[in-house]
Amino acid sequence: EPTMYGEILSPNYPQAYPSEVEKSWDIEVPEGYGIHLYFTHLDIELSENCAYDSVQIISGDTEEGRLCGQRSSNNPHSPIVEEFQVPYNKLQVIFKSDFSNEERFTGFAAYYVATDINECTDFVDVPCSHFCNNFIGGYFCSCPPEYFLHDDMKNCGVNCSGDVFTALIGEIASPNYPKPYPENSRCEYQIRLEKGFQVVVTLRREDFDVEAADSAGNCLDSLVFVAGDRQFGPYCGHGFPGPLNIETKSNALDIIFQTDLTGQKKGWKLRYHGDPMPCPKEDTPNSVWEPAKAKYVFRDVVQITCLDGFEVVEGRVGATSFYSTCQSNGKWSNSKLKCQPVDCGIPESIENGKVEDPESTLFGSVIHYTCEEPYYYMENGGGGEYHCAGNGSWVNEVLGPELPKCVPVCGVPREPFEEKQRIIGGSDADIKNFPWQVFFDNPWAGGALINEYWVLTAAHVVEGNREPTMYVGSTSVQTSRLAKSKMLTPEHVFIHPGWKLLEVPEGRTNFDNDIALVRLKDPVKMGPTVSPICLPGTSSDYNLMDGDLGLISGWGRTEKRDRAVRLKAARLPVAPLRKCKEVKVEKPTADAEAYVFTPNMICAGGEKGMDSCKGDSGGAFAVQDPNDKTKFYAAGLVSWGPQCGTYGLYTRVKNYVDWIMKTMQENSTPRED
């Protein structure tokens, strides 16, 4: 328990102290007091540095004194031979004696008293930052006006925190600026602007004077700016050392000014303003920005338009432009949207042709369409090369987005016809010599394939059967062979409007306009045994001259049989119409004069008995194309004749080309168009 005073005596005092003794006294006075220790008697064996016997006075870790020998008072009115004063409330006294004493020593006598200390003056470290006030047993600190005492009850500071600045422009300065700023203070200022604006701080070098850094470069007083996770500073020294313009990229800024106890300077002054948050001018490939500006800021909107051949895709749909807004966080909206190459997709397949699998279907890629040669060719030209265009379509230089059309090659037999033996002046033939040859089984007749959907024949063949069964691709018309060949199903029969329909067709004498078209339900697939014959051109090159040779083919009557099972063919010349008129009709159904001969008929034959006959009707009279020797065209159709083995009459197809084209056009499907 602390006491205000007390006495300390060496062992056995005033008798001689014993050898080999060590004794200590812990003196404690109340808090706020120091200790005054007075020695009134001292008689201890003398030795160098008091090594043998001694009394030691210790304060904390400090030895205040070590005594030995004899002392007497210098003042006849005072018994005090030695005194010690410490500004602390604790003191330790230690007495030690060694193993022998050469004489008899009586030791020491001492007393202590608690004395008031002046905390304000007695210590090297001043306890108060500003005003120190001493009283008996303690002290208290106080502050000048406008300062307040911190919770530690020692330090004074300025109440400079808590200000929040929300205006878009403002000025902030250290306390008392330009007078010296307060020591030992922490000033915090907050700038809080509307989202979308960044705080920009502006300082002038001469508006900044803060206590300089220590030798280690640490600021003793410091100014720091904190914006989100970014910090600017600490700054100190004479003249602002940082950038004079600080773009914080944030709408919130904390300014922290920290000062220590010493070295006050004039401080600092700054201006701030809110700048609309900038957004970076991003490099967005394959696009253009509108409007183009050097700097974009909060609320700016740009239209980003993809270059030709590029688009923004979302799911299965795309757009060529989009809008992007500079947002309050300094980032662009829609930054995920990228202009990517247009994808034209897998190219459409075409009938009777193919397109190779493209390596790429993106903008600029090239594909090639080809037709199934040698049976089909590209009717609408363009060469079959298409590139992926900017609008997402496969485009050809000639046709644009229109797909190539593979149409059958006409008039080219896979194998040329060569006469062998005579059968009504004709020879055996193979269907490959006449791939256009169509077989009608009721009535037994012929026809000519002119494209995928149409068969040309004689009107008299179909006038009695508007739903004829037809076959293509077979040399033999035996039932077993026909079962394996391609049967054609008619959709509609179109008889020329100039063909006169009779109640008793057997008595017919007028075969003018003996021509008909059969529209097929399904397209015919072309190949080596099935391909169409060409139609004549409209120019004078296709006007037949007497002596021009043509080929006829069919399964009609021969010298030996009423019907042929295998295909027969013959080459015959064109003859003047009078040659046909001169031949006597074999089984006339009327007067010879009643038979009608018109310019719509071709007369041919009369050479080596080669002729068409019953059962060949509707088959083509095929003539070599004058403009392309590799092709045959249907110059005529087997129509009628006065007598088999002489001359025959053929419908002059050239006179009906317009009707044929018009009929086909008016009755085609959209796919054919």
Partner: antibody
Amino acid sequence: QVQLVQSGAEVKKPGASVKVSCKASGFNIKEYYMHWVRQAPEQGLEWMGWIDPENADTIYAQKFQGRVTITADTSTNTAYMELSSLRSEDTAVYYCARSRLFFAYWGQGTLVTVSS
Amino acid sequence: DIQMTQSPKSLSASVGDRVTITCRASQDVRTALDWYQQKPGQSPKLLIYSASYRYSGVPSRFSGSGSGTDFTLTISSLQPEDFATYYCQQQYTTPYTFGQGTKLEIK
């Protein structure tokens, strides 16, 4: 196929918070923006905000600023919307939606009822 | 914020009718406008994007037009399944705002 499946209905007291989840399948949320839209009973649609799950950037409508937090967990392909300090007028169906160019896919909606 | 105003608020029509809904923006939104259809108890469905582009799978009777501040959604021949509420939405700038909706009812 693309699907957004939201968590179930919630009943909350005024002042409480609610967190609604939106689990995406058929696409990676990092490649899209995830939006939240709400619809009070017999009312129209109200856009609340969005997140870019790739970098966690968010934008909120001013009305909800400070009360709404949109987050995303790319490991589970899920977006979340948390609304705090609930009041009775926050009773609504909350939808998540995915966008690049437009809101092509929507969740089925989550009814949040705020009642004392 | 950009305000979107739809008119009319509601309208009655019959199957086969031609119907027009308009949407006005308080400031220029160029063509950054989408139209959505919502049926009771269902999530909204996208019909038209970028003012005039029909979203995939949307019937051709739906069409959109306009740019700047005035936009139109047209249904050329109303079908029974078209009775619903229609919303316009601007995606020109955040916040992305919706119109208040137009309820299309059977007459």
